[in-house]
Structures are given as structure tokens and as C-alpha cells.
């Protein structure tokens, strides 16, 4: 019968032959009266026979990543009947793996989008790169993950590529980071191959950020033959959030008087005010009232950014009309 | 903290007209918001107010003194001024210069003031 | 004009007293247009009260401000000795006018 050794034949062989095996008869007694075949994908190509022998050598180089294994046939004739010794068999010649592909990631680009302000340990989003190599064999195609860019606010999970938030960002201060994530495989260990993919993360607002008054003093005029409902001007707040969470109502927080009134206009954020009575120089002609600003929007989580609204101060002069 | 410096002569002919002028310091005379007022105090009375300037240059008076009086304001200087016309001797008085507050009309900083005679 | 009439003229005390100077207005004015100013002799005055409760910038506490519509009071709690001088309340409602001045003397 056959005599079977497992066959193996390294890839990426630089050598011009590389001995993978032999076939062999048991009944083979060695003075070369047998006559040994090699048949099938890659005989004669790939693989060729040393006839008396049965040495078989690799004569291409090979890569595993293309082609892992070879299924050629063995037969062995006596020259001197030219019958079969023993009947055709199949064998394989396994292609082994070196490490020889490094890990990429194959989903580029990477963008996640997180909310600022979020506490460490947030989930931000997975990368996965792919080795080429055998996962089964060593550790050619074992991946570990590293931060190269993004310390100290991400860090990455080394044997899953979870990125995860490790300190609190401010979308006022910034409100995009681009993550360097590194993935090696030989689980990092010396001759490891590596990839690397950029990962853009930008911040969403959150409400943190209550609207502050441009100037804590304002000077308006109003003319005492100005009817009620008349605009006397613009007081202005701004707010460091945006969308949803910059809007803002204005209101009048003290005017003993009850003489003036604050509407929003909400296109464009500014607080107007109005005439709620009319004005009489001889009577008084000056006033003093305080505005006051808050979003118009605030979760309820969120509320220790708003505990207090901000105010301003406007100084209103009266000016004269001659009456006739 | 803003200071204010009252300067000018201090004696003024009946007639003449007299010229104060009050220099800022520690903020700037265009902040928004302040007005800029002249006071004035005969000796031993109390305090009557004269007038007042914006840095816009817009300015109100004290009705009963308004024929006479006249303030301007100089930002490039920080310097606002006061002129009154046809002085008497009613007009002798310790003259202050002051800035309105943040939450009011009320005088929160002054100069030291200074004195006035109107004799021949 | 609003005329402040300020009583007493003279409010004789000694320290550790207390002092209530009153300031009557010529007619209504919201409190808020109302302030009271220290002055001793030789110097400019100085803003103790506004609106008419609110303390000025490093104003002790022993003094305080009341007061609506036309009758305006300010309250030295326990007189120290730096606080005889002449106290004058002011209107910033209408133009601006001035009372006429209480001056508080050691007894």
C-alpha cells in the first residue's frame, strides 16, 4: 500500500525547487524497477516528481492567500510490466501560511457622531480590520488595536476595536477629533504586520450653554409722542450652543413702572423692546428696567447649565416733544 | 475702577462764562451704557444737578440752567466738558463731575470736585 | 420738578444709636428711582443706596433703604463713629433732584 506523510509547503518560497515530500510504496524495495506519477491541478506546473524517487518539489512560488491547498493524484508503476504497483490515490499538499499580509480595514471611512459632554466609557464605535493570513494559524492573523491619535479623550478596546469616550469633551472647544486607530496582528508581538484608519468623530450639541447678554448695559431713547406697541430698540444675547438648543426668549425680569414690554423676534435672536404705555416727559423721563434671557428649549437633565437666567440692565431716556 | 479729575479756573468774572472739564480715568468715556453728569454744590448748600452728555455727544440739561449751558464730550481725549455762560455770583459752587451707575440713574463715581468763585 | 424734602435737617445721636432719616417726594416715584448719598465735609458724596434698597460697592450693612410712593426712609442700624456726616436722598425718575440734606451729629 501507500505510505503517507502529510505535505506541506511553505509559501512565499524564494527558492527555485522546494522539496515537499515523497510518495512511496511499501512495496517499493529501492532498485528503482518503480516508476512514480503526479497527476492533476498543478503537476508538472506548480509541482513536479522525481519519477524514481517519488521526491515531489515545488518549483513555483506560492501563495497561500490565493490558492491553500493542491489535490493531485499518485500512481506508481513497475517498468518492467507496466502495470499499477498500487491503485491511483488522491492526496493533498497543504499550502502553509506565513505572516505575510498585514491588517486592513476594509469599512473606510470611519465617522461616528457622539453627543459632547458624554461620560466616559460611552460607546463611540467599532472598527474591524482583516488579516489575510491563517486565523488558525498562530498568531499570523491575530489582531490587537492601539490609539496612535486621540488620547486622552478615546481609547480603544485592544482585542475588539470598540473606540470609547475616556474624558469629557466640549463641542464650544472643539467639536470634531480625528482617532488613529493602529491594528497589529501577532497579537503585537515582534515581526507583527499593521494597518492603520483614520476615524472622524464630531461632537453633537448638547444644551450646556445658557444665553449670556452681549452688553450688561443698554442706552434706548423713546420719543414721548411714541405711540404704544412702538419698537425702541434691540438688546442681544448669545449663546455658545447651536440649532435647537442657541434658541432663546427674552422677557422683562423688573420695570416697576410697567411701562415697556420684551418680545423675541426668533429669526434672528434679538430681544425688542416695546412700548407697553405711553410716556410723559413731565411725568418721568427716565427709566431703568431689567431684561432677563433663557432658552427656549432645556431638558430637564441639563438643567444645573441654567439655574440662572442672565440680565441686563437698559437705561431708557424720554425725549422731549413740544406740545403746541 | 473709574475715576474721574475735574479741572479748569477757579475764579470766573461775572459775565464770563466759566469752563470745566473732567478727565476719565481707569474706562473708557464710549462705554455703552454711561452717561457722563456735571453737579454742582454752592457752599454750605445742597447739590443741584447741571447735566448730563453721552459719549454720542447727545446731551440733556438741568431745565432751569438750560439757556446757559452747554457740556461736550471728547472720546479721543476720554475728557467731557462744561461750559455755563453769563455767570453771577449764584454760580460760585464746588462743581463735580460725575458717571451714572449699571443698574440706574443713580451717581456712582465721582470726582473730588471743584471749586468756583464768580467775583470781579 | 419733584422736590425731596429730607427731615430732620439735623439728626443729633451718639454712637451705637440708631438713626432714621426720612426723604418726602413732591409726588409718586416708583422706589426704584430712588438713592441716597453720604457726604463729609470736604469731600465728594458718596452712593450708599439705590433702588432704593439695593447697597452700593463696599457699603456695610448697617445701612439700609425702605420706602414706596412718596415717603423714602434710610436706616443707619447702630451709628459708628464714621457715619456723621450729611446725608442727601435723590430722585432719577424725573430729571434729577436732590433733598436738601440731613446732617447727623454727635450728641
Known amino acids: 500500500g501507500w505510505v503517507w506523510n502529510q505535505f506541506f509547503v511553505p509559501e512565499e518560497m524564494n527558492t527555485t525547487s522546494h522539496h515537499v515530500g515523497r510518495l512511496r510504496s511499501d512495496l517499493d524495495n529501492g532498485n528503482n524497477s518503480f516508476q512514480y506519477k503526479l497527476l492533476g491541478a498543478g503537476a508538472g506546473s506548480t509541482f513536479i516528481i522525481d519519477e524514481r524517487t517519488g521526491d515531489i518539489y515545488a518549483i513555483e512560488k506560492l501563495d497561500r492567500e490565493e490558492r491553500s491547498l493542491y489535490i493531485l493524484r499518485a500512481q506508481v508503476i513497475d517498468i518492467t510490466t507496466g502495470r499499477a504497483v498500487e491503485p491511483e490515490s488522491e492526496f493533498v499538499i497543504k499550502v502553509s501560511d506565513i505572516n505575510d499580509n498585514e491588517p486592513k480595514f476594509l469599512d473606510e471611512p470611519y465617522e461616528a457622531i457622539v453627543p459632547e459632554m458624554s461620560p466616559e466609557g460611552t460607546l463611540v464605535i467599532q472598527v474591524t480590520a482583516s488579516d489575510a493570513d491563517d486565523p488558525s494559524s498562530g498568531n499570523n492573523a491575530r489582531l490587537l488595536y492601539s490609539l496612535l491619535q486621540g488620547q486622552p479623550y478615546f481609547s480603544v478596546e485592544p482585542t475588539t476595536g470598540v473606540i470609547r469616550i475616556s474624558s469629557k469633551m466640549d463641542r464650544e472647544l472643539q467639536d470634531e477629533y480625528w482617532v488613529i486607530i493602529q491594528a497589529k496582528d501577532m497579537i503585537g508581538q515582534p515581526g507583527a504586520l499593521s494597518g492603520t484608519t483614520s476615524v472622524l468623530i464630531k461632537l453633537s450639541d448638547v444644551n450646556d450653554n445658557k444665553p449670556i447678554f452681549k452688553e450688561s448695559l443698554y442706552r434706548l431713547t423713546v420719543s414721548e409722542s411714541a405711540p404704544t406697541g412702538t419698537s425702541i430698540g434691540t438688546i442681544m444675547a448669545y449663546d455658545n450652543d447651536i440649532g435647537e438648543n442657541a434658541e432663546m426668549d427674552y422677557s422683562i425680569e423688573e420695570d416697576d413702572s410697567q411701562t415697556f414690554d420684551i418680545i423675541t423676534n426668533h429669526e434672528t435672536q434679538e430681544g425688542i423692546v416695546i412700548l407697553k404705555k405711553k410716556v410723559n416727559f413731565e411725568h418721568q423721563n427716565h427709566y431703568g428696567i431689567r431684561a432677563k434671557v433663557k432658552n427656549h428649549h432645556v431638558d430637564e437633565q441639563l438643567m444645573k447649565y441654567h439655574t440662572e437666567a442672565s440680565t441686563t440692565f437698559i437705561k431708557i431716556q424720554v425725549e422731549d416733544v413740544d406740545e403746541p | 475702577q473709574v475715576q474721574l479729575q475735574e479741572s479748569g479756573p477757579g475764579l470766573v468774572k461775572p459775565s464770563e462764562t466759566l469752563s470745566l472739564t473732567c478727565t476719565v480715568s481707569?474706562?473708557?468715556?464710549?462705554?455703552?451704557?454711561?452717561?457722563w453728569s456735571w453737579i454742582r454744590q454752592p457752599p454750605g448748600k445742597g447739590l443741584e444737578w447741571i447735566g448730563y452728555?453721552?459719549?454720542?455727544?447727545?446731551?440733556y440739561y438741568n431745565p432751569s440752567l438750560k439757556s446757559r449751558v452747554t457740556i461736550s464730550v471728547d472720546t479721543s481725549k476720554n475728557q467731557f466738558s462744561l461750559k455755563l455762560s453769563s455767570v453771577t455770583a449764584a454760580d460760585t459752587a464746588v462743581y463735580y463731575c460725575?458717571?451714572?451707575?449699571?443698574?440706574?440713574?443713580?451717581?456712582?463715581?465721582w470726582g473730588q470736585g471743584t471749586l468756583v468763585t464768580v467775583s470781579s | 420738578e419733584i422736590v425731596l424734602t429730607q427731615s430732620p435737617g439735623t439728626l443729633s445721636l451718639s454712637p451705637g444709636e440708631r438713626a432714621t432719616l426720612s426723604c418726602r417726594a413732591s409726588?409718586?416715584?416708583?422706589?426704584?428711582?430712588l438713592a441716597w448719598y453720604q457726604q463729609k465735609p470736604g469731600q465728594a458724596p458718596r452712593l450708599l443706596i439705590y433702588?432704593?434698597?439695593s447697597r452700593a460697592t463696599g457699603i456695610p450693612d448697617r445701612f439700609s433703604g425702605s420706602g414706596s410712593g412718596t415717603d423714602f426712609t434710610l436706616t443707619i442700624s447702630r451709628l459708628e463713629p464714621e457715619d456723621f456726616a450729611v446725608y442727601y436722598c435723590?430722585?432719577?425718575?424725573?430729571?434729577?433732584?436732590f433733598g436738601q440734606g440731613t446732617k447727623v451729629d454727635i450728641k
Open positions: 433702588g432704593p434698597s
Open positions: 409726588r409718586q416715584i416708583s422706589s426704584s428711582y
Open positions: 435723590q430722585q432719577y425718575g424725573s430729571s434729577f433732584t
Open positions: 452728555i453721552y459719549y454720542t455727544g447727545s446731551a
Open positions: 460725575a458717571r451714572d451707575g449699571s443698574s440706574g440713574w443713580y451717581f456712582q463715581y
Open positions: 481707569g474706562g473708557s468715556i464710549s462705554s455703552s451704557g454711561y452717561y
